[in-house]
Amino acid sequence: MMTGTIETTGNISAKKGGSVILQCHLSSTMAQVTQVNWEQHDHSLLAIRNAELGWHIYPAFKDRVAPGPGLGLTLQSLTMNDTGEYFCTYHTYPDGTYRGRIFLEVLESSVAEHSARFQIP
């Protein structure tokens, strides 16, 4: 039975050219996290963090995706095209798969504030 819940940074905004941390957290379960996948709006792969193999960054993003902190992901040199949904998929044992969603809005404005509060989607 899957008892866990994914908490995410929810809806966040960040400045064009800046960076943002995408973070999910699995709680309320003792399940072992074996892998976390990070995907973009169109379900294209950004990165994978495997417990035994480490990080795999999709080659096209190697220059502007940094692993971490923790199981999260730091997206750098943001462009307007980075606006959209991001998904974290947690593979766990014995529970199975959990999924979280984050919406990132990249703003032109130089006064854009980066809000990052944990919330359950």
Partner: antibody
Framework: QVQLVQSGAEVKKPGASVKVSCKAS????????MYWVRQAPGQGLEWIAF????????TYAQKFQGKATLTVDTSISTAYMELSRLRSDDTAVYYC????????????WGQGTLVTVSS | DIQMTQSPSSLSASVGDRVTITCRAS??????LSWYQQKPGKAPKLLIY???SLPSGVPSRFSGSGSGTDFTLTISSLQPEDFATYYC?????????FGQGTKVEIK
């Protein structure tokens, strides 16, 4: 097109070391990891390790920890694997292979380097 | 370690036949499985990744299916150039391991 060209065959004595090279072309070297796999005569495939050409960090199969050492020279887009304390059962064809876009699989392979260990 | 078991270890088939090779993982690997083809004296070549995705340049007669522990490689209509040895490999943990291989021979 993506190409991996490996160094030539080697004959070594037991206890010696060997360093195999793998020269990459046709892609941005630092965007991919380089994997090493071996195949003993008439046998199947055995993964040794991989190295992230961007960071230089390596991940080894436990069996090859301390036996294989992976390095890269990004200035010449070349990966290396050094094997130490060679034994006769290290006789095999050693392959380098570029990692896949979507995970830890092997997208493009070198032609292989035969390493023979014999006294 | 995750063990990969292929079956059969060898098979004989004719040109035009439909050929199926199976690969079983000792624990769930979701869809993190790839297939390779190797001809004698040559390096292996990637055929399938993530259980069912074909790299560009691989003929559409090759297909993959399965998830969890059970996977299948299918060649819909065997061609003369398909006689080779096929290996599966998981990419879900350390060590990455391969199946023992399936040799496809001419009947």
């Amino acid at each position: 097109q993506v190409q991996l060209v490996q160094s030539g065959a080697e004959v070594k004595k037991p206890g010696a070391s060997v360093k195999v090279s793998c020269k990459a072309s046709g892609y941005t070297f630092t965007r991919y990891s380089m994997y090493w796999v071996r195949q003993a005569p008439g046998q199947g495939l055995e993964w040794i390790a991989f190295i992230d050409a961007y960071s230089g960090g390596s991940t080894y199969a436990q069996k090859f920890q301390g036996k294989a050492t992976l390095t890269v020279d990004t200035s010449i887009s070349t990966a290396y694997m050094e094997l130490s304390r060679l034994r006769s059962d290290d006789t095999a064809v050693y392959y380098c292979a570029r990692g896949g876009d979507y995970g830890w699989y092997l997208g493009v392979w070198g032609q292989g380097t035969l390493v023979t260990v014999s006294s | 370690d995750i063990q990969m078991t292929q079956s059969p270890s060898s098979l004989s088939a004719s040109v035009g036949d439909r050929v199926t090779i199976t690969c079983r993982a000792s624990q769930s690997i979701y869809s993190y499985l790839s297939w390779y083809q190797q001809k004698p004296g040559k390096a292996p070549k990637l055929l399938i990744y993530n259980a069912k995705s074909l790299p560009s340049g691989v003929p559409s007669r090759f297909s993959g299916s399965g998830s969890g522990t059970d996977f299948t490689l299918t060649i819909s209509s065997l061609q003369p150039e398909d006689f080779a040895t096929y290996y599966c490999q998981h990419h879900y943990g350390n060590p990455l391991t391969f199946g023992q291989g399936t040799k496809v021979e001419i009947k």
